[in-house]
Interface confidence: low
């Protein structure tokens, strides 16, 4: 006997559906109506035939009362080939829900997204997370998706993007976006970062995560941020192969005074990089290849310094910097 595709936990909180059959019984997903977190994985199916069975142009207001009654706040949809028209139909209906977080992963969006009709209302998300989502429309995908969202988005995460650069002239500002995560886009690089950080479109960014994004030097990142007018409080550059030295011909970059936390862990550093901000509250240099304790003049003025997991540190060694957060135990790096 084949297992049930959907499982609802005992608290009616989380419901996970794995539709792996070639012709799945989508009605099984109705048992998720009482769940707060819903995950639907479509087993790589092409949902094109689904368009014939639903009226994507139907007025979603007819479903408003039903959708408002749903408890779902976090929705994950994954592993499918989805016509843009179907995605838009879903977004139009979900606009009447109380959904706060939407995650799309391992999706191929085919066709173009139509513009938002005048009478339609956008989806009031707090968080949008995309991982390995490809769009037929190339660089304009963010602008097309954005028009279906209300402007209150706070967190945007884009990983394994096929086109991490956006068509900036089409993108509107994200006035409430405080956290932008572009991690796990190894081909991005500093030039790509400049293209992705559309100038003046992210005025409220406080947290910027760039783990595993092909960044080369902190100074190069500083230049990209300055060009875009992005002034994060927290910057995560961990899991990049960073060079400690700066190209002598490169202009010196002044970091924004707003930056107070910098993560440079797992960056393969053999020495403290040049061109760091002069003052930081938190600096994480753990799990690098530092063979000696950094000298005070190599470091910014910093309250909390983490150096765990570097070769020069052996258990029992005196802490190398006042206020450092080292445990004295080498972590598994």
């Amino acid at each position: 006997t084949t297992p049930e595709p959907c499982e609802l936990d005992d608290e009616d909180f989380r419901c996970v559906c794995n539709f792996s059959e070639p012709q799945p019984d989508w009605s099984e997903a109705f048992q998720c109506v009482s769940a707060v977190e819903v995950e639907i994985h479509a087993g790589g199916l092409n949902l094109e035939p689904f368009l014939k069975r639903v009226d994507a142009d139907a007025d979603p207001r007819q479903y408003a009362d039903t959708v408002k009654a749903l408890r779902v706040r976090r929705l994950t949809v994954g592993a499918a080939q989805v016509p843009a028209q179907l995605l838009v139909g879903a977004l139009r209906v979900l606009a009447y829900s109380r959904l706060k977080e939407l995650t799309l992963e391992d999706l191929k969006i085919t066709g173009t997204m139509p513009p938002l009709p005048l009478e339609a209302t956008g989806l009031a998300l707090s968080s949008l997370r995309l991982r390995n989502v490809s769009w037929a429309t190339g660089r304009s995908w963010l602008a097309e998706l954005q028009q279906w969202l209300k402007p209150g988005l706070k967190v945007l995460s884009i990983a394994q993007a096929h086109s991490p650069a956006f068509s900036c002239e089409q993108v509107r500002a994200f006035p409430a976006l405080t956290s932008l995560d572009l991690s796990d886009n190894p081909g991005l690089g500093e030039r790509g970062l400049m293209a992705a950080l559309c100038p003046h479109k992210f005025p409220a960014i406080q947290n910027l995560a760039l783990r595993n994004t092909g960044m080369e030097t902190p100074t190069g990142v500083c230049a990209a941020l300055a060009a875009a007018g992005v002034q994060p409080h927290s910057l995560d550059l961990s899991h990049n192969s960073l060079r400690a030295t700066v190209n002598p011909s490169a202009p010196r970059c002044m970091w924004s005074s707003a930056l107070n936390s910098l993560n440079l862990s797992f960056a393969g550093l053999e020495q403290v990089p040049k061109g760091l901000p002069a003052k930081l509250r938190v600096l994480d240099l753990s799990c690098n290849r530092l063979n000696r304790a950094p000298q005070p003049d190599e470091l910014p003025e910093v309250d909390n310094l983490t150096l765990d997991g570097n070769p020069f540190l052996v258990p029992g060694t005196a802490l190398p910097h006042e206020g450092s957060m080292n445990s004295g135990v080498v972590p598994a790096c």
């Epitope: 706060k100 707090s126 209150g152 967190v155 956290s179 995560a209």
Partner: nanobody, 122 residues
Framework: QVQLQESGGGLVQSGGSLRLSCAVS????????MGWYRQAPGKGRELVAE??????NYADSVLGRFTISRDNAKNTVYLQMNSLKPEDTAVYYC?????????????????WGQGTQVTVSS
């Protein structure tokens, strides 16, 4: 521990008014949505009014009579109830959707108050 403290319920005559308050004891969370629900004897809990993403939603049965508002400085949400009817009799619950103000994953938490009784006599 996040707690919601409701107040303002009571007995009122038909046509009268009441103002419910709900204070949120919250520090490490940012409030996304706040709302009021009610549950009449033998019935399910239903949405009365909600502040969501900067907009307000009301149940059709209270539209024009009830007004929801929020004081961000006091982390308090109010429900002004005018022209009360006997069918408004219920236990009124405050609800808050909270999300962690820290970094991803942006955790969601739903919190309910203990409820305050509203009785409308004819």
């Amino acid at each position: 521990q996040v707690q919601l403290q409701e107040s303002g319920g009571g007995l009122v005559q038909s046509g009268g008014s009441l103002r419910l308050s709900c204070a949120v004891s919250v520090s490490i969370f940012s409030i996304v949505d706040m709302g009021w629900y009610r549950q009449a004897p033998g019935k399910g809990r239903e949405l009365v009014a909600e502040l969501s993403g900067g907009s307000t939603n009301y149940a059709d049965s209270v539209l024009g009579r009830f007004t929801i508002s929020r004081d961000n400085a006091k982390n308090t949400v109010y429900l002004q109830m005018n022209s009360l009817k006997p069918e408004d009799t219920a236990v009124y619950y405050c609800n808050a959707d909270l999300t962690g103000s820290s970094w991803y994953p942006y955790r969601f938490l739903e919190v309910w108050g203990q409820g305050t009784q509203v009785t409308v006599s004819s």
